[in-house]
């Protein structure tokens, strides 16, 4: 018997006299694109050196990083069973499409959110006599796109009894924000800063007139707008 290391660094036994036609490999696309609110499929197929393996197995998907990232999905199949019984599905949104017995670990992700963007890694573990495991090193990058959505718009007190307006929008690609209002040319005064991740915030630093101020967010998938109103009480002359 000789030993070798698998992709996760574990020492594994392989029969010295076996000459497997296949070696361990995993096939995943570099990137998958999908829209927020929709579903995505993360394809993953594999080959392995254990001819006609029919023992117990576990299929795992994790996010973030290989080997150590948090699991988002896990299922186990009993010896001889075609059914992989789901043991973990984060937020109930991950469903195994593929049949691990047929070397397919493809996963469906439902009700996508922008926060689902990132890398996902598939892993299979043979837990019977042929104790072996393999995990994709590079994984598949899920890129969730979304039309703009304005998540917050507000008027806040500013310096010297003035007021300022803030608009925060999210989307992927990150949307461009623009302000318009009753004062001529005030949209050019918007200060745009990148928020965290897929959120963008734009500030209108000085609201000089009463009236309606509108924030517009736009990206290649669409546009959204929201308005706030400024009405100041002007005291009667003494």
């Amino acid at each position: 018997v000789k030993t070798r290391r698998d992709a996760s660094g574990d020492l594994l036994n392989t029969e010295a006299h076996s000459a497997p036609a296949q070696r361990w490999s995993m096939q995943v696309p570099a990137e998958v694109n999908a829209e927020a609110g929709d579903a995505a499929v993360l394809p993953c197929t594999f080959t392995h050196p254990h001819r006609h393996y029919d023992g117990p197995l576990t299929a795992i998907w994790r996010s973030g990083e290989p080997y150590a990232g948090p699991q988002v999905f896990r299922c186990t199949a009993a010896p001889g069973s075609e059914l992989c019984q789901t043991a973990l599905s984060l937020h109930g949104r991950f469903r195994l499409l593929g049949n691990p017995r047929r070397n397919d670990l493809s996963l469906r992700v439902e009700r996508l959110a922008l926060a689902d963007s990132g890398r996902y890694f598939c892993r299979v573990e043979f837990t019977g006599d042929a104790h072996d495991r393999y995990e994709s090193r590079h994984g598949v990058r899920l890129r969730v796109t979304a039309a703009p959505r304005i998540v917050n718009i507000s008027v806040l007190p500013g310096p010297a009894h003035a007021f300022r307006a803030l608009c925060t929008a999210e989307g992927e690609p990150p949307p461009a924000l623009a302000w318009s209002g009753p004062a001529p040319g005030n949209s050019s005064a918007a200060l745009q800063g990148q928020g965290h991740g897929y959120q963008v915030t734009a500030e209108l630093p000085a609201l000089t007139r009463d009236g309606r101020y509108t924030c517009t967010a736009a990206n290649s998938l669409g546009r959204a707008e929201a308005s706030v109103y400024l009405f100041r009480f002007h005291g009667a002359p003494g």
Epitope: A39, V41, L83, Q85, T86, A87, S89, G92, R95
Partner: antibody, heavy 121, light 111 residues
Framework: EVQVVESGGGLVQPGGSLRLSCATS????????MNWVRQAPGKGLEWVAQ??????????FYAESLEGRFTISRDNSKSTVYLQMNSLRAEDTAVYYC????????????WGQGTLVTVSS | DIVLTQSPDSLAVSLGERATINCRAS??????????IHWYQQKPGQPPKLLIY???NLASGIPARFSGSGSGTDFTLTISSLQAEDVATYYC?????????FGQGTKVEIK
């Protein structure tokens, strides 16, 4: 052998209520999603509702036109799924089939024989 | 909702001949190479029976003369050599997006 047996159908007046039951055996009920699909006399198939299993938080899904009137539920200890139908209308007259689906696919791999619901005055 | 339109509505085929049924979706039902279209057979007085899942996978116990193909919006169910017991109505169904919807059905008869 997988068995799916519906019961509870019958004649009901418009505005009335009915509760359908679907008793299953021959498989591990907890591992599967369960559904109701209906077929009006001489017409095609219409998906009605789905209930997922514990891992999937027993999430329920409905055909939009039925939501609010119909409620799907399951009793894992009895391997049984139910469909509570309220405010019934003449257009709800159909054979109601109980179906099983795998957690990974919303297709229906086993069907019961169906139970006929007739809504008429 | 995704609308599935089957064609033809009915089909008469000689015994031993090929029968082809089409199913067109109002939008793509394929994601990353997976097509969420399934086919059922319903004989008179019986519940439907799963024939094909995800466009081309033969369900357990279904004869190999049944096959499915297609991607995107256009799908086909083929019976390579029609047998007397294949007389039935055939339905396609999509599970790309909820609510799951069915085609209107295609009735297959012997010519």
């Amino acid at each position: 052998e997988v068995q799916v047996v519906e019961s509870g159908g019958g004649l009901v007046q418009p505005g009335g209520s009915l509760r359908l039951s679907c008793a299953t055996s021959g498989f591990n009920f907890n591992d599967y999603f369960m559904n109701w699909v209906r077929q009006a006399p001489g017409k095609g198939l219409e998906w009605v509702a789905q209930i997922r299993n514990k891992i999937y938080t027993y999430a329920t899904f409905y055909a939009e036109s039925l939501e609010g009137r119909f409620t799907i539920s399951r009793d894992n200890s009895k391997s049984t799924v139910y469909l509570q139908m309220n405010s019934l209308r003449a257009e709800d007259t159909a054979v109601y089939y109980c179906t099983r689906s795998l957690t990974g696919g919303d297709y229906f791999d086993y069907w019961g024989q169906g139970t006929l619901v007739t809504v008429s005055s | 909702d995704i609308v599935l339109t089957q064609s033809p509505d009915s089909l008469a085929v000689s015994l031993g001949e090929r029968a082809t049924i089409n199913c067109r979706a109002s939008q793509s039902v394929t994601i990353s190479g997976y097509s969420f279209i399934h086919w059922y057979q319903q004989k008179p007085g019986q519940p439907p029976k799963l024939l094909i899942y995800r466009a081309s996978n033969l369900a357990s116990g279904i004869p190999a003369r049944f096959s499915g193909s297609g991607s995107g919006t256009d799908f086909t169910l083929t019976i390579s050599s029609l047998q007397a017991e294949d007389v039935a109505t055939y339905y396609c169904q999509q599970s790309r997006k909820s609510p799951w919807t069915f085609g209107q059905g295609t009735k297959v008869e012997i010519k």
